[in-house]
Interface confidence: medium
C-alpha cells in the first residue's frame, strides 16, 4: 500500500530508498552490536536492564506478517528519535567512566542521526505524514548514581540492538511488497 | 546522611610525598565515581582529578598529570589522593566530591595542605 | 586563567535581581551540562543548579541557571544578605578529559 490516491511520489523508485535505509540501519545495528560487548568488557552486566524513558519494542515475530510500510517508517522513527535523545544523554550525564566511550558514543549518535534523517527523506519522498510522537517527550533525570548511568547505558545500547535487528527484518520485508 | 571527611593534610617540604583520605559513609561508595577538587588561599577552585565507580577509570587535570596518583578501596569506602613531588603551588585545601555523573552532589569540609621550605 | 570565564564581582541590594555569566566553549559548555556552586565565607562549596537549570532539595526557587550554546548564566532574584558568597559555574571539558571550573563570582550584598 502507497501512499493515498492523488499524492505524487516524488521519487522514482522507492525500493531503492528502503535499500539505502536498510543498509544504513545494518551499519548502525553492527555499531551497537561491537559498542554493546565493548560495554560488557568494560562494566560486566549483571543481569538484563531496562529503562523506563526508553519506547517498547515496535516489532516482535508476531507482528512481521501484518507490517504496513507508513505505520513501520513513523514508528522507527519516533522509537529512534527517543534513542538518539537517550544516546546524547548518556554522552553528557555518565561522567567518567562512560566518558572513556566517547569516541564510539559520539560516532554511534552521528550514524543515528545520519539514519533519522534517511528515514525522513525517505517518508517525504513516499508523501508519509512525518508524524510526531504521542506522548509529549519528557526530560531524561540525572542519572542517581555512576552505576546507575553503567545500567542505563546497557539497557539503552541493548535496546538499540533489539529495535534496529527488528527495522532491519521490518523493512527489508516491505521492500518485497513494494 | 552523606558523609565525606577528609585527612592527611599537613605542612610539607617541596619535593617530598603526602597522602590524602576521604572517608565515605552514609551511601554506597562503590556506585559512585569520587573526585578530588583543591582550592589555594584566596583563590578559586581547581579540579584535581576523577576515579570511576569501579577504580578503573582516572583523568588529571594537567598541572598534576604524573605526580598525583587518585585511588579508592570500595572495601573501606575510602578515597585517597597520593601527592608526590609536591611544589608550592600545591598548597590548598583539598576536597573529596561524590558525583552521580555531571556533578558535585557532596563535598567533604575539605582539609590543608601547606607545601613549604 | 580559567577556562569558564565569570565576572569577578557582582552585587546588588536586598530584593534585587541579579545575574552572573559564564563563558565557555564548544567543547565543555557547548557539549556539556553546567553546574553551579556556591560557597559561604569559610565554607565548602554546595551545589546550587546542575544539569544547566535544576535546584536540587533545598535550594530555594530564587535560584536559577539557564544556557544558551556556549554560554550560561546564575540568576538570583530577591536577594538576601545570606546570598553573600562566592559562585562558580562548571563543566566537564571533553578536550580536556576533566572538569572545568570558572575563576568564581563575588557576590556582595549592598
Known amino acids: 500500500p502507497g501512499p493515498p490516491a492523488g499524492s505524487p511520489r516524488v521519487s522514482s523508485d522507492p525500493r531503492a530508498d528502503l535499500d539505502s535505509a536498510v543498509l544504513l540501519t545494518r551499519s548502525l545495528l553492527a555499531d551497537t552490536r561491537q559498542l554493546a560487548a565493548q560495554m560488557r568488557d568494560k562494566f560486566p552486566a549483571d543481569g538484563d536492564h531496562s529503562l523506563d524513558s526508553l519506547p517498547t519494542l515496535a516489532m516482535s515475530a508476531g507482528t512481521l506478517g501484518s507490517l504496513q510500510l507508513p505505520g513501520v517508517l513513523t514508528r522507527l522513527r519516533v522509537d529512534l528519535m527517543s534513542y538518539l535523545r537517550h544516546v546524547q544523554w548518556l554522552r553528557r550525564a555518565g561522567g567518567p567512566s562512560l566518558k572513556t566511550l566517547e569516541p564510539e558514543l559520539g560516532a554511534l549518535q552521528a550514524r543515528l542521526e545520519r539514519l533519522l534523517r534517511r528515514l525522513q527523506l525517505l517518508m517525504s519522498r513516499l508523501a508519509l505524514p512525518q508524524a510526531a510522537p504521542d506522548q509529549p517527550v519528557i526530560p531524561l533525570g540525572p542519572p542517581a548514581s555512576a552505576w546507575g548511568s553503567i545500567r542505563a547505558a546497557h539497557a539503552i545500547l541493548g535496546g538499540l540492538h533489539l529495535t534496529l535487528d527488528w527495522a532491519v527484518r521490518g523493512l527489508l520485508l516491505l521492500k518485497t511488497r513494494l | 546522611q552523606v558523609q565525606l571527611l577528609e585527612s592527611g593534610g599537613g605542612v610539607v617540604q617541596p619535593g617530598r610525598s603526602l597522602r590524602l583520605s576521604c572517608a565515605a559513609s552514609g551511601f554506597t561508595f562503590s556506585h559512585y565515581d569520587m573526585h578530588w577538587v583543591r582550592q589555594a588561599p584566596g583563590k578559586g577552585l581547581e579540579w584535581v582529578a576523577v576515579?570511576?565507580?569501579?577504580?578503573?577509570?582516572?583523568f588529571y587535570a594537567d598541572s598534576v598529570k604524573g605526580r598525583f596518583t587518585i585511588s579508592r578501596d570500595n572495601s573501606k569506602n575510602t578515597l585517597y589522593l597520593q601527592m608526590n613531588s609536591l611544589r608550592a603551588e600545591d598548597t590548598a585545601v583539598y576536597y573529596c566530591?561524590?558525583?552521580?555523573?555531571?556533578?558535585?552532589?557532596?563535598w567533604g569540609q575539605g582539609t590543608l595542605v601547606t607545601v613549604s621550605s | 586563567q580559567s577556562v569558564l570565564t565569570q565576572p569577578p564581582s557582582a552585587s546588588g541590594t536586598p530584593g534585587q535581581r541579579v545575574t552572573i555569566s559564564c563563558s565557555g566553549s564548544s567543547s565543555n559548555i557547548g557539549s556539556n551540562y553546567v553546574n553551579w556552586y556556591q560557597q559561604l565565607p569559610g565554607t565548602a562549596p554546595k551545589l546550587l543548579i546542575y544539569?544547566?537549570?535544576l535546584r536540587p532539595s533545598g535550594v530555594p526557587d530564587r535560584f536559577s541557571g539557564s544556557k544558551s550554546g556556549t554560554s550560561a548564566s546564575l540568576a538570583i532574584s530577591g536577594l538576601r544578605s545570606e546570598d553573600e558568597a562566592d559562585y562558580y559555574c562548571a563543566a566537564w571539558d571533553d578536550s580536556l578529559s576533566g572538569v572545568v571550573f570558572g575563576g568564581g563570582t563575588k557576590l556582595t550584598v549592598l
Open positions: 566530591a561524590r558525583t552521580p555523573g555531571s556533578h558535585f552532589d557532596y
Open positions: 576515579i570511576s565507580y569501579e577504580g578503573s577509570n582516572k
Open positions: 544539569y544547566d537549570d
